[in-house]
């Protein structure tokens, strides 16, 4: 910017250096140059001589005007034209901001990646500032009413160390910058129920030689979390629409889910857990793909007739990607397919 | 109970320096977020800066790029070092609990005064 000029005069904008975006705004330029009477004063947005709305209001001062002003940034100078110089001559030059009051902070939501050591709180800020706005995350303790603060741009990680106090919190965020200030709704937070397990991931997969060939995928993660909820989604890579099955978890062991799939197709399988119980996800793992293996015998293909041995109630729904590149964003479609898993065998195997 | 005592005030000339400072004791400084605020004569309280636990900081605009807020927390102490002073920072200079907000909980305060 131009903030560390040296002025030979004075340059002051009405109402402030930083307003509110599309506000009517005045811009002051008044020289105190020694020897020179001004013919004329010249201000300058970014660099480019400005014609229009300026008025001479004495001898020493001109103003220009501004109607709705709407760029965020602007850097404006002014200048002297004085007798005899073949230059004009810098009075003085000042940055100008526009934008808006922060909105009210919304969605917020805390969770704690186990082993991470952190609280990871996230919100979304709303509309654009254009200005710098900040944010300040109050945690207070149900238990102590102590409350600690921090200070974050767009999300912040908070020490469990910091939390040992107490189990309860009540979190909330305020939004803050030169134009407003505006506070969140504030969520109610035990530490108890905020945690995602590990990682969850597909270690790999393999196409058996059956009669009717099956998939078994392996997935795997270092949760201690006992019970944990998780869901496996999958589809062909040809396809928008997603299968998803669930299942009840133990990682003591490597989980092993068989599924029932077209032939000579390419499937991408992820998954995502959650401790059983509990609303927070983990995001789904990273893709893995896998071939299935060709066609041995002639028959007609049924996906959705795999031979279950017992059916349960549990469901597997399929989801529509909105497109293919935002595979997080889904849309419910159905969920009317059974799962099932055999008689014998200590894990949770599907059809 | 909760003590804040503030020192470093005095008299400068425009463009001088000082470095405030506010010792703290009944309560767990270094897990604490502070701030100063300022009061000019006939004037209203006026938040200047603020600081949080993990050294993160935020300013009035009117000061940004002039102010520096610091804390040491082996010290319990919270500092403002004040460069290129203007006759406008002319004021009572007071700390307290809390990165944001334009109020104090009665600690007497330093007085800082710009003139030449």
């Known amino acids: 910017g131009i903030t560390s000029i040296n002025c030979s005069g004075d340059m002051w904008v009405e109402p402030g250096e930083i307003f509110q975006m599309g506000m009517n705004v005045s811009i002051y330029c008044q020289e105190a140059l020694k020897h020179c009477r001004p013919r004329n004063l010249y201000f300058y947005k970014n660099g480019f001589k400005e014609e229009f709305d300026i008025t001479r209001i004495n001898r020493t001062t001109a103003r220009i005007w501004y109607k709705g002003f709407s760029e965020p940034h602007a850097y404006m100078h002014c200048t002297a034209e004085c007798p005899g110089h073949f230059q004009e001559t810098l009075i003085c030059g000042k940055d100008i901001s526009s934008g808006h009051p922060p909105d009210a902070p919304s969605n917020l939501t805390c969770v704690i990646y186990e082993y991470s050591g952190n609280m990871t709180c996230t919100w979304n800020t709303g509309k654009p500032t254009y200005i710098d706005t900040k944010y300040i995350v109050h945690v207070k303790s149900l238990e102590t009413e102590e409350e600690q603060q921090y200070l974050a741009s767009s999300y912040v990680k908070i020490s469990t160390d910091s939390l040992q106090g107490s189990r309860k919190y009540l979190v909330w965020v305020q939004a803050v910058n030169s134009l407003g200030m505006e506070n969140s709704q504030q969520l109610h937070v035990h530490l108890d129920d905020i945690v995602i397990p590990s990682a969850s991931i597909i270690s790999r997969a393999e196409t058996t030689n059956d009669t009717v060939p099956k998939t078994i995928v392996y997935w795997k993660s270092k949760t201690m979390i006992e019970k944990v909820f998780c869901e496996m989604r999958y589809k062909t890579t040809t396809n928008q629409t997603w299968s998803v099955k669930e299942f009840d978890a133990n990682f003591t062991y490597v989980q092993q889910s068989e599924f029932y799939l077209e032939p000579d197709s390419k499937y991408v399988f992820q998954v995502r857990c959650q401790e059983t119980g509990k609303r927070n996800w983990q995001p789904w793992s990273s893709p893995f793909v896998h071939q299935t293996s060709q066609e041995t015998g002639k028959r007609n293909w049924q996906p959705w007739s795999s031979p279950f041995v017992h059916q349960t109630s549990q469901t597997v729904s399929q989801v529509t990607a909105k497109s293919s590149h935002e595979p997080q964003k889904m849309e419910m479609l159905s969920a009317t397919i059974f799962r099932g898993h055999p008689a014998s065998g200590n894990h949770q195997d599907i059809g | 109970q909760v003590q804040l005592q503030e020192s470093g005030g005095g008299l400068v000339q425009p463009g001088g320096s000082l470095r405030l400072s506010c010792a703290t004791s009944?309560?767990?400084?270094?897990?604490?977020?502070m701030r100063w605020v300022r009061q000019a004569p006939g004037k209203g309280l006026e938040w200047v800066s603020g600081?949080?636990?993990?050294?993160?900081?935020i300013y009035a605009d009117s000061v940004k790029g002039r102010f520096t807020i610091s804390k040491d927390n082996a010290k319990n102490t919270l500092y403002l070092q004040l460069n290129s002073l203007k006759t406008e920072d002319t004021a009572m200079y007071y700390c307290?609990?809390?990165?944001?907000?334009?109020?104090?909980?009665g600690s007497q305060g330093t007085q800082v005064t710009v003139s030449s």
């Open positions: 307290a609990q809390g990165v944001y907000g334009d109020t104090y909980s």
């Open positions: 009944g309560f767990t400084f270094r897990l604490a977020a």
């Open positions: 600081i949080d636990s993990r050294g993160s900081t």
